[in-house]
């Protein structure tokens, strides 16, 4: 896997340990927590990043209406089980044998159960709605300039092809970025929208996952775009399965 040859670091993931022990003395980087080799020319999967985060010392840390099936990550951090490709396993369990099913971005999509709970497949999150509120500015941003800059950001910083940025909506001070990526659309080598959204979320929080690269400095025509609130909604190809008790709560 590629990494900076000279100082042997991983530009796309600072939560790695790198050493020149790859074939021919090439730099190879492994994710903290899992020890899995990562490809440093692209984003690391969210599952491996969450696992690394949980293993790290604790101090290292026209608007669209979301569909009724949209999920929000209310459960927060957990130590996930990842498959050999670094994807979330469909079933996640904690140390007390409480289990639940997750989607491809690792967000719970069923009620919690016990070890008998079955999660037949990893359901793909095909639509992500990133809802941002920006800090007050002298005037509203120009919508087309904002759209262009956000598309460029996802392309250049997160290597997400612009075709997966379905739309950028803006009603000051709310910005919504829609990412869409069906299973059939995602080709080998394409960055997953879930991984791009996670890197973006961490960037917005000032917790960049990139090694040596500056923090996120988002500007529209030279004017800084500073985000004060972020909410992310996840829509799966198959609607989630929660009991009526939760739905009416």
């Amino acid at each position: 896997h590629t990494a900076a040859q000279d100082n042997c670091t991983c530009p796309t993931n600072k939560m790695t340990v790198c050493s020149p022990d790859g074939p021919g003395g090439r730099c190879q980087c492994r994710a903290l927590g899992s020890g899995m080799a990562v490809d440093c020319s692209t984003l690391t999967s969210k599952c491996l990043l969450l696992k690394a985060r949980m293993s790290a010392p604790k101090n290292a840390r026209t608007l669209v209406r979301p569909s009724e099936h949209a999920l929000v990550d209310n459960d927060g951090l957990y130590d996930p089980d990842c498959d050999p490709e670094g994807r979330f396993k469909a079933r996640q369990c904690n140390q007390t044998s409480v289990c639940w099913c997750v989607n491809s971005v690792g967000v719970r999509r069923t009620d919690k159960g016990d070890l008998s709970l079955r999660c037949d497949e990893l359901v793909r999150t095909h639509h992500i709605l990133i809802d941002l509120r920006h800090r007050p500015t002298a005037g509203a941003f120009n919508h087309s300039d904002l759209d262009a800059e956000l598309r460029r950001l996802f392309r250049e910083r997160y290597r997400l092809h612009p075709k997966f940025v379905a739309a950028v909506h803006y009603e000051q001070p709310t910005i919504q970025i829609e990412l869409r990526q069906n299973t059939s659309q995602k080709a080998a080598g394409d960055v997953d929208i879930g991984d791009a959204a996670y890197y973006f979320e961490r960037d917005i929080k000032g917790e960049s996952l990139f090694q040596g690269r500056g923090g996120l400095d988002l500007r529209v025509r030279g004017e800084p775009l500073q985000v004060e609130r972020t909410l992310i909604y996840y829509l799966d190809e198959i609607p989630p399965k929660f009991s009526m008790k939760r739905l009416t709560a």
Epitope: A148, R151, E156, R159, K163, V191
Partner: antibody, heavy 118, light 109 residues
Framework: QSLEESGGDLVQPGASLTLTCKAS????????ILWVRQAPGKGLEWIGS???????TYYANWAKGRFAISKTSSTTVTLQMTSLTAADTATYFC?????????????WGPGTLVTVSS | YDMTQTPASVSEPVGGTVTIKCQAS??????LAWYQQKPGQPPKLLIY???DLESGVPSRFKGRGSGTDYTLTISDLEAADAATYYC????????????FGGGTEVVVK
């Protein structure tokens, strides 16, 4: 798959000109089209680009304000140039990215010559 | 993200080796391409991602580098390799003057 530029001409200083890039054999959507120029005996100079599906446009710092790229049909992209000077004399190429998130240009048109002279 | 390419011109005999250097003003994370251009023709993509060979390009062309420093090496030079070669940073199109290096003319004696 091919690209072809047209509209190159001999024009007076201060004039405006519109160049057209026509795509054949592939769907323009999901690609970016970039305009690059080359003055006689000089190197390549990036002018700007458009991401077709989203319509977003981007320009080199020196090209902002005087050059405008737009998609005019399902197969054509134009480059509008205003206030032309002798320094704009060049062969103008349109090129397509490779369909990835990077800007590697794997398909080029043959170019069209623009001469600005009185 | 200025791209500085050296040398401006180089001359080598058939069978020789040429190395062209390209330096970016900032880290471009291996997002670099090399193009070959012959007189009267548009540029042709040779190498992308700093070291990956475009389909149909002979393995005599070798790209390497990371960070800000990149090289293109052409070994076993052939007469057909006489051309001008350009590097291009493929990382960003934001707030730049040009994404291409100044070019290197390769003369094959």
């Amino acid at each position: 798959q091919s690209l072809e530029e047209s509209g190159g001409d001999l024009v007076q200083p201060g004039a405006s000109l519109t160049l057209t890039c026509k795509a054949s054999g592939f769907d323009l959507n999901n690609y970016s089209i970039l305009w690059v120029r080359q003055a006689p005996g000089k190197g390549l100079e990036w002018i700007g680009s458009i991401y077709i599906s989203g319509g977003s446009t981007y320009y080199a710092n020196w090209a902002k304000g005087r050059f405008a790229i737009s998609k005019t049909s399902s197969t054509t992209v134009t480059l509008q140039m205003t206030s032309l000077t002798a320094a704009d004399t060049a062969t103008y190429f349109c090129a397509r990215d490779d369909g990835t998130a990077s800007y590697y240009l794997n398909l080029w048109g043959p170019g069209t010559l623009v001469t600005v002279s009185s | 993200y200025d791209m500085t390419q050296t040398p401006a011109s180089v001359s080598e005999p058939v069978g020789g080796t040429v190395t062209i250097k390209c330096q970016a003003s900032e880290d471009i994370y291996k997002l670099l391409a090399w193009y070959q251009q012959k007189p009267g023709q548009p540029p042709k993509l040779l190498i992308y991602a700093a070291s990956d060979l475009e389909s149909g390009v002979p393995s005599r062309f070798k790209g390497r580098g990371s960070g800000t420093d990149y090289t293109l090496t052409i070994s076993d030079l052939e007469a057909a390799d006489a051309a001008t070669y350009y590097c291009q940073q493929a990382y960003t199109i934001g707030n730049i003057d040009n994404s291409f290096g100044g070019g290197t003319e390769v003369v094959v004696k």
